[in-house]
């Protein structure tokens, strides 16, 4: 278990022309509110896919009215950090959304009005109880200047919170086998109650007995790197388990590399293999630069030659974002015909056809069973040249591919608008309300009104639902 | 090919009622958004109408304006109509059928129309 | 809601450089969801700018989209005789219900 921070340093017009009017007039004063939304992983998830890993909602910042004539300036930002606990394992990489909000507070008809004003993502490695890292995004014309880190909440320590300390029982050292508990050195490791040998950087339990492998690592005792096929370099007793030699101690144990960077062994000591925005010899120094590479997908990175001057990512075809990275949605505009599936592979747009149609961009119908079946259980019924589907329930469309209609349950609240989509259906959330299905209100003083958290978690550990 | 072709308009008189019917071919209302009308007065501006979800929900929106004499309504996976009744002469347009997708994050993107259907509204 | 276009009709010569802008008298959705159409006579309108300033499929590069909230602008650059045709601006909005409205257009005239 655990807290990942995020700290707001500045949120305002970026570099270069085409500087941003003001969100607030003095017709229209407004103030700003964030949320955030993490995942597991370094996944490309959708704006709209739930925060697996917690999401939470800042307080509202100050009251801000622009200065008739004035450009935009950095806007006042809300008090204190955004906290989102984490209950299980910190899982070291992840992605992230930070979302910017403006609360309207002319005299609008029933209260106050909300309007995004900028999303910016990213994916991230960070290990837990490291330093606060610095980052720089930009949406369009906006930059938000952050940083973050993940802290474990005792008595869980170590990089993934996974290991547990206890107070010692001794005042002088730690029970046979039992390491002292870094920072915490009064403390120390408790007993292991996972499956003998598990590992304790790269495994964890919740039961005891048992040997659950972080991401990137497997094995019974989450030893064996994910990536490696064969076995690790031998430097130890052989495993009869795995056939496979288990390392001994080394120069990476405890993996000296800060801010997710991760460490391989030289002849004569270590070498951090660091995380965009991290370098240095364990990778402690942050300030995200072009020399860090912080552009995803092929972007060029231009500018940014201090980590106190921004970058900007000109992105390849097929990628936006501050940092490219995010997907262009160019499906959206349904260039498959005929109810074909449209998949961007990024250099070119493929359609898959439903049975009966063929091309490109499936404009050419067959027309006929032979040789064809509908899809999901669907039987298929010849009749003059052309051929129909009788479809399993739960299913529709010339051969059954369609499932059925998702917004038929009109799963979009508080009067948000759905839409089918490729990747299912997506809700369009009328303003004052937010999240997947528009189910939940933002209220004026900043809190979510979320459900109650079920067993195991704190009453005050909501958002993780958002 | 994706296409919208609206039928049903004519010459209708003053306090009369209309029917007018938007055919797709090429993909069905239910694998899109949604499906409106937008009319346009001869030699004037865009005028957004209404609109109905394209799934089996039969969600709508309407313009003020229009609420209370003209209905939106699905008939088939490829048929939409729009109803209008106390017709006057101001109701005289080109009447387009059009499809609203979602579009990052964006919405009312009319991405397709049909040709239109001339309503002509006189004694 | 009521959103402006000014200025019409606008007119300037081939290769040239044409600016229209729209004025929303309130923010539109999301302080983005605005559209630019394209019709010329006889014809329906035609999808070239979204979110403001997201280009529509196949529409040239020589169409930009800009602004938020209230203000939009429109520029066509490198004017062709093709371009010559009414533009109109389109904003989203919610009030107890989703609605949309048009601009009045604004007719570009190519010398």
């Known amino acids: 278990a655990g807290v990942f921070e995020l700290q707001i340093h500045s949120f305002g017009p970026g570099p270069g022309p085409g500087a941003p009017r003001s969100p607030c007039s003095a017709r229209l004063p407004c103030r700003l509110f964030f949320r955030v939304c993490l995942k597991p992983g370094l996944s490309e998830e959708a704006a709209e896919s739930p925060c697996a890993l917690g999401a939470a909602l800042s307080a509202r910042g100050p009251v801000y009215t622009e200065q008739p004539g004035a450009p935009a300036p950095d806007l006042p930002l809300p008090d204190g950090l955004l906290q989102v606990p984490f209950r299980d394992a910190w899982p070291g990489t992840f992605s992230f959304i930070i979302e910017t909000w403006r609360e309207e507070l002319g005299d609008q008809i029933g209260g106050p009005a909300w309007s995004l004003l900028a999303r910016v993502a990213g994916r991230r490695r960070l290990a837990a109880g490291g330093p606060w890292a610095r980052d720089i995004q930009r949406a369009g014309a906006w930059e938000l200047r952050f940083s973050y880190r993940a802290r474990c909440e005792p008595p869980a320590v170590g990089t993934a919170c996974t290991r547990l300390c206890r107070p010692r029982s001794a005042p002088s050292r730690c029970g046979p086998g039992l390491r002292p508990c870094a920072p915490l050195e009064d403390e120390c490791e408790a007993p292991l109650v996972c499956r003998a040998g598990c590992s304790p950087e790269h495994g964890f339990c919740e039961q005891p007995g048992e040997c659950r492998c972080l991401e990137g690592w497997t094995g019974p005792l989450c030893t064996v790197p994910v990536s490696t096929s064969s076995c690790l370099s031998p430097r130890g007793p052989s495993s009869a388990t795995t056939g496979c030699l288990v390392p001994g101690p080394g120069p990476c144990d405890g993996n000296p590399c800060a801010n997710g960077g991760s460490c391989s062994e030289t002849p004569r000591s270590f070498e951090c293999t660091c995380p965009r925005g991290f370098y240095g010899l364990r990778c402690e120094v942050s300030g995200v630069t072009c020399a860090d590479g912080p552009c995803f997908n092929g972007g060029l990175c231009v500018g940014g030659a201090d980590p106190d001057s921004a970058y900007i990512c000109h992105c390849p075809p097929g990628f936006q974002g501050s940092n490219c990275e995010k997907r262009v949605d160019r499906c959206s505009l349904q260039p498959c015909r005929n109810g074909g599936l449209c998949l961007d592979l990024g250099h070119a747009l493929r359609c898959r056809c439903r049975a009966g149609f063929a091309g490109p961009r499936c404009e050419h119908d067959l027309d006929d069973c032979a040789g064809r079946a509908c899809a999901n259980g669907g039987t298929c019924v010849e009749g003059g040249g052309a051929h129909r589907c009788s479809c399993a329930l739960g299913f529709g469309g010339r051969d059954c591919r369609e499932r059925a209609d998702p917004c038929a349950a009109r799963p979009c609240a508080h009067g948000g608008r759905c839409y089918a989509h490729f990747s299912g259906l997506v809700c369009a959330c009328a303003p004052g309300y937010m999240g997947a299905r528009c189910e939940f209100p933002v209220h004026p003083d900043g809190a979510s009104a979320l459900p109650a958290a079920p067993p195991g978690l704190r009453p005050g550990d909501p958002q993780r639902y958002l | 090919q994706e296409q919208l072709v609206e039928s049903g308009g004519g010459l209708v008189q003053p306090e009369g009622s209309l029917t007018l019917t938007c055919t797709a071919s090429?993909?069905?209302?239910?694998?899109?958004?949604?499906m409106c009308w937008v009319r346009q007065a001869p030699g004037k501006g865009l005028e957004w109408i209404a609109c109905i979800s394209g799934g089996s929900s039969g969600d709508t929106d309407y313009a003020n304006w229009a609420k209370g004499r003209f209905s939106i309504s699905k008939t088939s996976s490829t048929t939409v109509t729009l109803q209008m009744t106390s017709l006057t002469v101001a109701d005289t347009a080109t009447y387009f059928c059009a499809r609203d997708v979602y579009i990052d994050s964006t919405i009312f993107n009319f991405n397709l129309w049909g040709p239109g259907t001339l309503v002509t509204v006189s004694s | 809601q009521v959103l402006t276009q000014t200025p019409s009709p606008v007119s300037a010569a081939v290769g040239g450089t044409v600016t229209i802008s729209c004025q929303a008298s309130?923010?539109?959705?999301?302080?983005?969801?605005l559209a630019w159409y394209q019709q010329k006579p006889g014809q329906p309108p035609k999808l070239l700018i979204y979110?403001?300033?997201s280009l529509a499929s196949g529409v040239p590069s020589r169409f930009k989209g800009s602004g938020a909230g209230t203000q939009f602008t429109l520029t066509i650059s490198d004017l062709e005789c093709d371009d010559a045709a009414t533009y109109y601006c389109?904003?989203?909005?919610?009030?107890?219900?989703?609605?949309?409205?048009f601009g009045g257009g604004t007719e570009v005239v190519v010398k």
């Open positions: 309130q923010s539109v959705y999301n302080n983005n969801n």
């Open positions: 389109q904003g989203t909005y919610y009030s107890s219900g989703w609605y949309s409205t």
């Open positions: 979110a403001a300033s």
């Open positions: 090429g993909f069905s209302f239910s694998s899109s958004g949604y």
